[in-house]
Amino acid sequence: AGVFELQIHSFGPGPGPGAPRSPCSARLPCRLFFRVCLKPGLSEEAAESPCALGAALSARGPVYTEQPGAPAPDLPLPDGLLQVPFRDAWPGTFSFIIETWREELGDQIGGPAWSLLARVAGRRRLAAGGPWARDIQRAGAWELRFSYRARCEPPAVGTACTRLCRPRSAPSRCGPGLRPCAPLEDECEAPLVCRAGCSPEHGFCEQPGECRCLEGWTGPLCTVPVSTSSCLSPRGPSSATTGCLVPGPGPCDGNPCANGGSCSETPRSFECTCPRGFYGLRCEVSGVTCADGPCFNGGLCVGGADPDSAYICHCPPGFQGSNCEKRVDRCSLQPCRNGGLCLDLGHALRCRCRAGFAGPRCEHDLDDCAGRACANGGTCVEGGGAHRCSCALGFGGRDCRERADPCAARPCAHGGRCYAHFSGLVCACAPGYMGARCEFPVHPDGASALPAAPPGLRPGDPQRYL
């Protein structure tokens, strides 16, 4: 596990002629924020493909107003690093997309207007634990200067964050088969890193990131015992060969969260929601007040500054948690209607609508029939971003302009002959059949499967299909 860190140094006009106009003006002040998207390997994927390694958003930069007559300078940047945590091994090669977004603080009563100013992309090789790498990328007339690095989260070390380092148990040397951890010579390399949360008692790995179970244990983290005894109330899949599965201790069993924190299971581990005044992985850090500046991501601290007083953080848009430490994934609620693509910009949700739909949440079905006339008495039907005409009898085609051949589909059954008629079609039935489509056989004794024919119409007469 580790963190990819991106530091934006400047965003402004690139060298050479054709300097871009400032994105902000006295009439339309604005501010910038950045989004980074990481993908493993060196593949050149579409910008919309998932950020499999992770993604992050910056805070919003200071509000900027261009001074009349001044050239577009480097624009004021948001505070802090963009951090993309990764759970498993660092891949060594990766693709990145860095987007510069502009928020206009203009006259949009419904909220701010968002627009993508620039997007740069690249493919790089990078070893974890190395120094900051500096980069310059150009997008049109704009230039973005930034640095990046990947660092391992202790106790992981190495260029892929797959080795573990532990303090030495003996003062002089490491255990059998384990080397000293450079540059931490006072620590020893530990066995390779299994999948996060893999049971140390019942699981093992031969490759980084995997979790293979010892006999008698199962589950993705080898925490579920396989029981061959009969189950009174099986809660897992049961079979004659394996018996039934009894859920073993889950990551929240025994509540690892201290100080009244509540535990919730995550796919690979657990997460503590801490009460006010506590934070940390297990809510173990206490005695925090506003004087300690506990709120992340620009959150404002509310509450007493004295040690006995709890605090709360008022979080900026896009963040939540007792310390504003959690980014809100509002796209998980699937707010975009009618198949729209959701984009969480952190400070606002943006829905990219499919053709034929509009609105902040793609909730408006555009009037596909506006200005579209259906000929010959046809009526227009909306749907799916395209208009369709429901045509009157005898007409067809997209706009009901074509005279339809009602007999083209061979509607008369049992060898009946079809005749086009001004109001539809008429079937002349073969001997022994009757009905509008000649679908009913006439019984040998002369009776029919239908009620008596209407007066003046003998079985075998042409039946007009209305």
Partner: antibody, heavy 119, light 112 residues
Framework: QVQLQESGPGLVKPSETLSLTCTVS?????????WNWIRQPPGKGLEWIGY???????NYNPSLKSRVTISRDTSKNQFSLKLSSVTAADTAVYYC????????????WGQGTLVTVSS | DIVMTQSPDSLAVSLGERATINCRSS????????????LAWYQQKPGQPPKVLIY???TRESGVPDRFSGSGSGTDFTLTISSLQAEDVAVYYC????????FGQGTKVEIK
């Protein structure tokens, strides 16, 4: 351009409640920022009264907390100040101001409105 | 509460000369998580609302002339006007936003 405009009575009697409204144009008060009230007695310095955030959370100056309520009307894009049990010491120019989470700075100020407390 | 104290209360400087205003807080305004000092400087001209000049103790607001600069960390901060202009006559306030918001009492800058 974001604009803030204070409105309300210029004269309030002692012991009554001072009520002011700030009308915001050019930006939705539910999108971002914390929306503050700050006052300045004639010839004196600035005093922060409190704020309401884009999501409706409030925070007040401890010295005024027992008398202050800040609320909002999102349909009109307005936020309001109520200060109860006023005295002559509450005579001041009252400003509505928006603050930026990123910098924790008071970015943009209304022109201010003078409220006099007198019988 | 954090108390902000400015010095001097007033200052008379010749045009083109340097003006220096000091601000001291009763506790540190440095946030070790963000590596920022949450101190801002404001300028208020007669009959106008204040306007932000400097934030994070030393970052100049867009559009503010570069003769204005801020420095300092922790509890002691300084606003410097390197070459005073006639339009700089105003009252200057420091403000902390580390915990709640409090302003200094103000420093009046005049031309000598």
């Amino acid at each position: 351009q974001v604009q803030l405009q204070e409105s309300g009575p210029g004269l309030v009697k002692p012991s009554e409640t001072l009520s002011l409204t700030c009308t915001v144009s050019g930006y939705s008060i539910t999108s971002d920022f914390y929306w503050n009230w700050i006052r300045q007695p004639p010839g004196k310095g600035l005093e922060w009264i409190g704020y309401i955030t884009y999501d409706g959370s409030t925070n007040y100056n401890p010295s005024l907390k027992s008398r202050v309520t800040i609320s909002r009307d999102t349909s009109k894009n307005q936020f309001s100040l109520k200060l109860s049990s006023v005295t002559a010491a509450d005579t001041a120019v009252y400003y509505c101001v928006y603050g930026d989470f990123n910098r924790h700075a008071m970015d943009y100020w209304g022109q201010g409105t003078l409220v006099t407390v007198s019988s | 509460d954090i108390v902000m104290t400015q010095s001097p209360d007033s200052l008379a400087v010749s045009l083109g000369e340097r003006a220096t205003i000091n601000c001291r807080s009763s506790q540190s305004l440095f946030n070790s998580r963000t590596r920022k000092n949450y101190l801002a400087w404001y300028q208020q001209k007669p009959g106008q609302p204040p306007k932000v000049l400097i934030y994070w103790a030393s970052t100049r607001e867009s559009g503010v002339p570069d003769r204005f600069s801020g420095s300092g960390s922790g509890t002691d901060f300084t606003l410097t006007i390197s070459s005073l202009q006639a339009e700089d006559v105003a009252v200057y306030y420091c403000e902390q936003s580390f915990y709640l918001f409090t302003f200094g009492q103000g420093t009046k800058v005049e031309i000598k």
